[in-house]
């Protein structure tokens, strides 16, 4: 039975050329996290495997850095980075939990962090 919830950084915005940390946190479950996938729409950005560690997709190697923790840091942001990002937690024995973050990359310096929210 899946009892866990994923808390994410929610809707966030950042300036073009800057960097942003995408962060999710799984709580309210005793399940063991075996892998976390980070995806942008249908593109795999990175995998953090409990045993093998981090793997960054080759096409994102220059602009994506692992961490902090199970999070992901996006660097040298462009307007094209605007969109949905997903953290997919593979857990034993619960199964898969998914969190969603919407990132807006702004041209100006009016970027503000959105409020945190939960996805059950």
């Amino acid at each position: 039975m899946m009892t866990g919830t994923i808390e994410t950084t929610g809707n966030i915005s950042a300036e073009k050329g800057g960097s942003i940390i995408l962060q999710c946190h799984l709580s309210s479950t005793t399940a063991q996290v075996t892998q976390v996938n980070w995806e942008q729409q249908d593109q795999l950005l990175a995998i953090c495997n409990a045993d093998l560690g981090w793997h960054i997709s080759p096409s994102f190697k220059d602009r994506v850095a692992p961490g902090p923790g199970l999070g992901l840091t996006l660097q040298s942001l462009t307007v094209n980075d605007t969109g949905e990002y997903f953290c997919i937690y593979h857990t034993y024995p619960d199964g898969t939990y998914t969190g969603r973050i919407f990132l807006e990359v702004l041209e100006s310096s009016v970027a503000e962090h959105g409020a945190r929210f939960q996805i059950p």
Partner: antibody, heavy 121, light 106 residues
Framework: EVQLVQSGSELKKPGASVKVSCKAS????????MNWVRQAPGQGLEWMGW????????TYAQGFTGRFVFSLDTSVSTAYLQISSLKAEDTAVYYC??????????????WGQGTLVTVSS | DIRLTQSPSFLSASVGDRVTITCRAS??????LAWYQQKPGKAPKFLIY???TLQSGVPSRFSGSGSGTEFTLTISSLQPEDFATYYC????????FGQGTRLEIK
């Protein structure tokens, strides 16, 4: 080589306690959940539950609460199963088995060689 | 709880035979099914995960198929070392094993 080595057979009297050990080697102990499986004589496999090797948090399957305790000593990569107030019906082979994984798929591999616990007066 | 029912419970066959073991789940489990082989006095040996993916080192005469509620394990040409008991296991919700299928030499 990834392997699990369990402690030897035990002969116990009803009401006694037993502690079975399962020593892991060849991999990072805290990266893989550990399970316990019971097989009574001539019977099938019964999942007893598992322990989170990151947090030490145990989860017990139905029928295995109360007298059964899973624990860890991560410093020596060892999982333990303790059974208290032993009954004749606890006579069985007890296996530890590591959870293997690929993405969202899981399985048990490897398995320990099994520990026979016999409860008899 | 999800129950797994294996059929047959007992199977007698000869070397070279093609045999199929069926595992039915009481409710849909997608492809979250594994198969194991156990010989007398030994620990179970992992064969297949995700219903059809063969574990490294397992002979190709073993194959698995199915999704949802019905799954099969097939041995295309039985070898002497294949006579054993086979178990299916679901890993979709509250892990359970089938009752086992004992494969004996005819």
């Amino acid at each position: 080589e990834v392997q699990l080595v369990q402690s030897g057979s035990e002969l116990k009297k009803p009401g006694a306690s037993v502690k079975v050990s399962c020593k892991a080697s060849g991999y990072t102990f805290t990266s893989y959940p550990m399970n316990w499986v019971r097989q009574a004589p001539g019977q099938g496999l019964e999942w007893m539950g598992w322990i989170n090797t990151n947090t030490g948090n145990p989860t017990y399957a139905q029928g295995f609460t109360g007298r059964f305790v899973f624990s860890l000593d991560t410093s020596v990569s060892t999982a333990y199963l303790q059974i208290s107030s032993l009954k004749a019906e606890d006579t069985a082979v007890y296996y530890c088995a590591r959870t293997g994984y690929s993405g969202s798929y899981y399985w048990f591999d490897p398995w320990g060689q099994g520990t026979l616990v016999t409860v008899s007066s | 709880d999800i129950r797994l029912t294996q059929s047959p419970s007992f199977l007698s066959a000869s070397v070279g035979d093609r045999v199929t073991i069926t595992c039915r789940a009481s409710q849909g489990i997608s492809s979250y099914l594994a198969w194991y082989q156990q010989k007398p006095g030994k620990a179970p040996k992992f064969l297949i995960y995700a219903a059809s993916t063969l574990q490294s080192g397992v002979p190709s005469r073993f194959s698995g198929s199915g999704s949802g509620t019905e799954f099969t394990l097939t041995i295309s040409s039985l070898q002497p070392e294949d006579f054993a008991t086979y178990y299916c296991q679901q890993l979709n919700s509250y892990l359970t094993f089938g009752q086992g299928t004992r494969l004996e030499i005819k």
